[in-house]
Interface confidence: low
Amino acid sequence: SSSPTSSASSFSSSAPFLASAVSAQPPLPDQCPALCECSEAARTVKCVNRNLTEVPTDLPAYVRNLFLTGNQLAVLPAGAFARRPPLAELAALNLSGSRLDEVRAGAFEHLPSLRQLDLSHNPLADLSPFAFSGSNASVSAPSPLVELILNHIVPPEDERQNRSFEGMVVAALLAGRALQGLRRLELASNHFLYLPRDVLAQLPSLRHLDLSNNSLVSLTYVSFRNLTHLESLHLEDNALKVLHNGTLAELQGLPHIRVFLDNNPWVCDCHMADMVTWLKETEVVQGKDRLTCAYPEKMRNRVLLELNSADLDCDPILPPSLQTS
């Protein structure tokens, strides 16, 4: 790779509002922001672990891959990457681990080729509903994004502003139906307790969905029916107790699906019968032979595939006359 070059000018220390304005000066052909490394041959700019507090204004127009990881950006304002001429080739933007806690509406506007965005490992207390759509119209222009990586973006509990984190993220995913072309969505490690019911129906192009290492208890209200292209569904390390008939049927109906269910606290009582029957027949669950019961105590560590209907009982419900208050 070509050796890194740096511009002679010092890194912009202009007021934050200037970062959201479209830079009027076209960068010099070989200009590279201070504190960054640039390779025109590889169309790559890396500004990594530099404690940057704002996006450099003098990014070269050739940039296709931009790494801004390990910085202290805090806020991504509207038009954070808007430039004259525009960064027309920017296809992959990695902002992981840059202490972002706010991403504003239109933060990624004027990036017509942006296909992959990684915001992982940022404590996003305030993700605008219009962060990805750029507009509050009911139907926005389609986003070019095909891969959106949002692993571990949950902020500390005391920074969540008393609102549903799941709802905030989903609002950003659904706004303006801009992400209809999204193929990969990673939402691992976000403490999600539930998945809002309409989210998947509006992401029909998904091939890969990673919800691992969350706290999902149930998929009862989640529909997978529209996701005919879905190839992998990662649900490892959640709090799932059982999958009900509707979910099982929908998963079975997806032509290319592989489902990953390891490390969930399966409850092996009478409600588990349908899932056990399905597991014995289906080919879609990867590693199904290692799924084990967590509850009730007498069933702990039993392998789901080895259970039969006699194993799956429910304690009888006491008649009202015998119930204690």
């Epitope: 296709r64 891959n65 790494f67 296809a91 992959a92 933007l93 990695n94 296909r115 992959q116 965005l117 990684d118 095909v146 891969e147 990586i149 692993n151 193929r183 990969r184 990673e186 691992a188 490690s189 091939r207 890969h208 990673d210 691992s212 290492n213 190839e231 992998s232 990662h234 490892e236 390390d237 990953f260 390891d262 490390n263 990867q286 590693g287 032979d289 290692r290």
Partner: antibody, heavy 121, light 107 residues
């Protein structure tokens, strides 16, 4: 049918450069991370580099960092490895492989047949 | 970097034997461990992924177990075609290191 076909190997002098290519077919290329793995003669497998589906994230083994560059052209379904400042210890068969999986685990489910790179004066 | 240590480095066994190969990680890698088989002059082949999932098309005599730092590949009854070199690989860290390999030879 998934197929991966490496090319670009050959004999090169120490300090020289080489670019390997891996032509992919039979799957939705841009939806999968890809990787290069090498094997020196008579030795074990060494993971070299990986790249995410859209090319936005790249990773390198310490032994090649700063000398090798992984990239991909999704419009051509092709993975590349640009190797500069080559050393004798870079002599190996280089395999390209497809990643499958998620955030916490991934695996290489399809491999090419390999291309031999020999660094010698 | 996460280091992977395989043992033994070589092993002689007979057809029909039960064989166990172990792999130890220098830190916890949860279940992000894969096993590959390689025969001379050929590309590696995925056997087991995510510690214990059998790759499609791989015979059921192969099995994997373990999580955290200690993992095992077991071949329940060796067949002639199983004599090869076996590698573990972790994919938990950003650098996806392999073990040094275990060569399984005919006794």
């Amino acid at each position: 049918e998934v197929q991966l076909l490496e090319s670009g190997g050959g004999l090169v002098q120490p300090g020289g450069s080489l670019r390997l290519s891996c032509a992919a077919s039979g799957f939705d290329f841009e939806s999968y991370a890809m990787s290069w793995v090498r094997q020196a003669p008579g030795k074990g497998l060494e993971w070299v580099s990986a790249i995410s589906g859209s090319g936005g994230s790249t990773y390198y083994a310490d032994s090649v960092k700063g000398r090798f560059t992984i990239s991909r052209d999704n419009s051509k379904n092709t993975l590349y490895l640009q190797m500069n400042s080559l050393r004798a210890e870079d002599t190996a068969v280089y395999y390209c492989a497809r990643y499958y999986g998620g955030y916490y685990s991934a695996w290489m489910d399809y491999w090419g047949q390999g291309t031999l790179v020999t660094v010698s004066s | 970097d996460i280091q992977m240590t395989q043992s033994p480095s070589s092993l002689s066994a007979s057809v029909g034997d039960r064989v166990t190969i172990t792999c130890r990680a220098s830190q916890s890698i949860r279940s992000a461990l894969n096993w590959y088989q390689q025969k001379p002059g050929k590309a590696p082949k995925l056997l087991i992924y995510a510690a214990s999932s059998l790759q499609s098309g791989v015979p059921s005599r192969f099995s994997g177990s373990g999580s955290g730092t200690d993992f095992t590949l077991t071949i329940s009854s060796l067949q002639p075609e199983d004599f090869a070199t076996y590698y573990c690989q972790q994919t938990y860290g950003y650098l996806h290191t392999f073990g040094q390999g275990t060569k399984l030879e005919i006794k």
